[in-house]
């Protein structure tokens, strides 16, 4: 039985330069306990895009829209998109610990940037 699912419903998102990109992610359970973080890319070189607890992410805002009982919304919006923001973004659930350990990742959303 699945303990938890991380759902990124959009395989890809295309945004015009200068606009905002909404990256959707819903999670079906808070258990196991631990934070949700967003990354661009995969593997050891991935870039942290948003962490609720710590760090400064001036272009990122949270955009919870879901009122459904069966999942919780951990979507983000990234403002003032530029071509440098293109890439695949992953919503990742961590299990709380010392240190926190990655538990499950969403399938990823590929962000492409159109010219203005």
């Amino acid at each position: 039985e699945e303990e938890l699912q991380v759902i990124q419903p959009d395989k890809s998102v295309s945004v015009a330069a200068g606009e905002s990109a909404i990256l959707h992610c819903t999670v079906t359970s808070l258990i196991p306990v631990g934070p949700i973080q967003w990354f661009r890319g995969a593997g050891p070189a991935r870039e942290l895009i948003y962490n609720q607890k710590e760090g400064h992410f001036p272009r990122v805002t949270t955009v919870s829209e879901s009122t459904k009982r069966e999942n919780m919304d951990f979507s983000i919006s990234i403002s003032n998109i530029t071509p440098a923001d293109a890439g695949t973004y992953y919503c990742v659930k961590f299990r709380k610990g010392s240190p926190d350990t990655e538990f499950k990742s969403g399938a990823g959303t590929e962000l492409s940037v159109r010219a203005k």
Epitope: E1, E2, E3, L4, T28, S29, L30, I31, P32, V33, I36, Q52, T62, V63, S64, T67, R69, E70, N71, M72, D73, F74, S75, I76
Partner: antibody
């Protein structure tokens, strides 16, 4: 119709043990996080223990950690709370509760009373 | 631990009037725009019953005279108009961080 039926409560001496059970029906038990919450007239509602849907992860507050053990049998739609080294302050009504998302408590049983007294 | 302080401890309201209950958390219970604050109703001799989940969402089957609002540390449960069957004790609960905690309860009576 969702039903959660607790059993196993009773009178026990300090230092003793009890095993509470919760029989679930009317929903897909194996998909739900399950918890115990207790209620006393003095302390109100207090979260006691939680177990993940597959049974891998368990969580306890400091007040019961090391003394209480939560387990589940998804094949039997049952939840169990083993309570050891019981203290007078563990006296309460114990409710079994389900949590679809591991967040809010969706459904509650009617409760079973545990009294710890010499 | 996140401490939840409910006020008032008891409340007497006339039938058909508005009842307002406050719950203040010692720290924010918000994450990614979700407010992990919930409200329950408990009548004598019965278990608690979920009314509102995640601050403002009405649980299925709950009358729409119940509503919830708030974010971060300050939350409100409103019953409008109050009916006789709403006499009960109401509790807030946070699931933002372990240990999960409850408010001390607000007893609602008819004036």
């Amino acid at each position: 119709e969702v039903q959660l039926v607790e059993s196993g409560g009773g009178l026990v001496k300090p230092g003793g043990s009890l095993r509470l059970s919760c029989a679930a029906s009317g929903f897909t038990f194996s998909s739900y996080v399950m918890s115990w919450v207790r209620q006393t007239p003095g302390k109100g509602l207090e979260w006691v223990a939680t177990i993940s849907s597959g049974g891998t992860y368990t969580y306890y507050p400091d007040s019961v950690k090391g003394r209480f053990t939560l387990s589940r049998d998804n094949a039997k739609n049952s939840l169990y709370l083993q309570m050891n080294s019981l203290r007078a302050e563990d006296t309460a009504v114990y409710y079994c509760a389900s949590q679809l998302t591991g967040s809010e408590f969706d459904y509650w049983g009617q409760g079973t009373t545990v009294t710890v007294s010499s | 631990d996140i401490v939840l302080t409910q006020s008032p401890a008891s409340l007497a309201v006339s039938l058909g009037e508005r009842a307002t209950i406050s719950c203040r958390a010692s720290e924010s219970v918000d994450s990614y725009g979700n407010s992990f604050m919930h409200w329950y109703q408990q009548k004598p001799g019965q278990p608690p019953k979920l009314l509102i989940y995640r601050a403002s969402n009405l649980e299925s089957g709950v009358p729409d005279r119940f509503s919830g609002s708030g974010s971060r540390t300050d939350f409100t449960l409103t019953i409008n108009p109050l009916q006789a069957e709403d006499v009960a004790t109401y509790y807030c609960h946070q699931s933002a961080d372990l240990p999960w905690t409850f408010g001390g309860g607000t007893k609602v009576e008819i004036k």
